[in-house]
């Protein structure tokens, strides 16, 4: 009777567009067929997927975030068959280009400015803000109470992912009008 197989990996946290991952189905056995499934489906046809070592090793080249799925290997012979527990690949990616919310760029003096920055990233990115190039707090949300025309300028959200070593940013212009001088938007 065949034992329950397990999956070993040479890279548990690969970086998108940079790393390859090799899964190996353990143990090695004679007269045994090795099979693989991804998210419960048979392996898709892809130039980035390669089976080797008698199908015992599955290699994913140039991993992407879409490879973050559940991988299962199976072994079978003429007597029995067995499957491994799933191993979910944790692909590190991003940070993608951020989005600052809300989209309003014109405000009335006295309003509160509440800007939120979102960037897709694994792991979650570190956020920081700069106003007119001057560093502000390291938070995802920038809040300034009762803004005045002195708060006019460029507001930049910076995101960094220490795991991938990558950074990204987005810049937004904010105009604050004195009350009663412009039909600006209040926050």
């Amino acid at each position: 009777e065949l034992p329950k197989p397990s999956i070993s990996s040479n890279n548990s946290k690969p970086v998108e567009d940079k790393d390859a991952v090799a899964f190996t189905c353990e143990p090695e056995a004679q007269n045994t067929t090795y099979l693989w499934w991804v998210n419960g489906q048979s392996l898709p046809v892809s130039p980035r997927l390669q089976l080797s070592n008698g199908n015992r090793t599955l290699t994913l080249f140039n991993v992407t975030r879409n490879d973050a799925r559940a991988y299962v290997c199976g072994i079978q012979n003429s007597v029995s068959a067995n499957r491994s527990d799933p191993v979910t690949l944790d692909v590190l990616y991003g940070p993608d280009t951020p989005i600052i919310s809300p989209p309003d760029s014109s405000y009335l003096s006295g309003a509160n400015l509440n800007l939120s920055c979102h960037s897709a990233s694994n792991p979650s990115p570190q956020y920081s803000w700069r106003i007119n190039g001057i560093p502000q707090q390291h938070t995802q949300v920038l809040f300034i109470a009762k803004i005045t025309p002195n708060n006019n300028g460029t507001y930049a959200c910076f995101v960094s992912n220490l795991a991938t070593g990558r950074n990204n940013s987005i810049v937004k212009s904010i105009t604050v009008s004195a009350s009663g001088t412009s039909p600006g938007l209040s926050a």
């Epitope: 975030r65 973050a68 951020p98």
Partner: nanobody, 119 residues
Framework: EVDLVESGGGLVQAGGSLRLSCAPS????????MAWFRQAPGKEREFVAS????????SYADSVKGRFTISRDATKNTVYLQINSLEPEDTAVYYC????????????WGQGTQVTVSS
Amino acid sequence: EVDLVESGGGLVQAGGSLRLSCAPSGRTSSLDTMAWFRQAPGKEREFVASTNWNRGGASYADSVKGRFTISRDATKNTVYLQINSLEPEDTAVYYCAASTRGIVSDNYWGQGTQVTVSS
């Protein structure tokens, strides 16, 4: 310049489902992040879900995980937000947003589509 047009909103009973669509046009070759936000009456606009236009993947706000699914159809040039098990608290204007990559990145927003959930 990128234009975003949302559709699919409406009035639905609690427990029901909706599929929102966002169709970008213009300089779509530079698209990076595609996201959905929502704004309930009297509340701040909040992030709901996002995907990467070229790479896929998905990230969600904790409040919608398991009920909302973001997806993209490259053949139809459209991003979808499937909303299941709707609750009255999901009532809001849902906005599609996009970021572009390049020497100068930018954000773009649609006009929004109203989702009203009745109990």
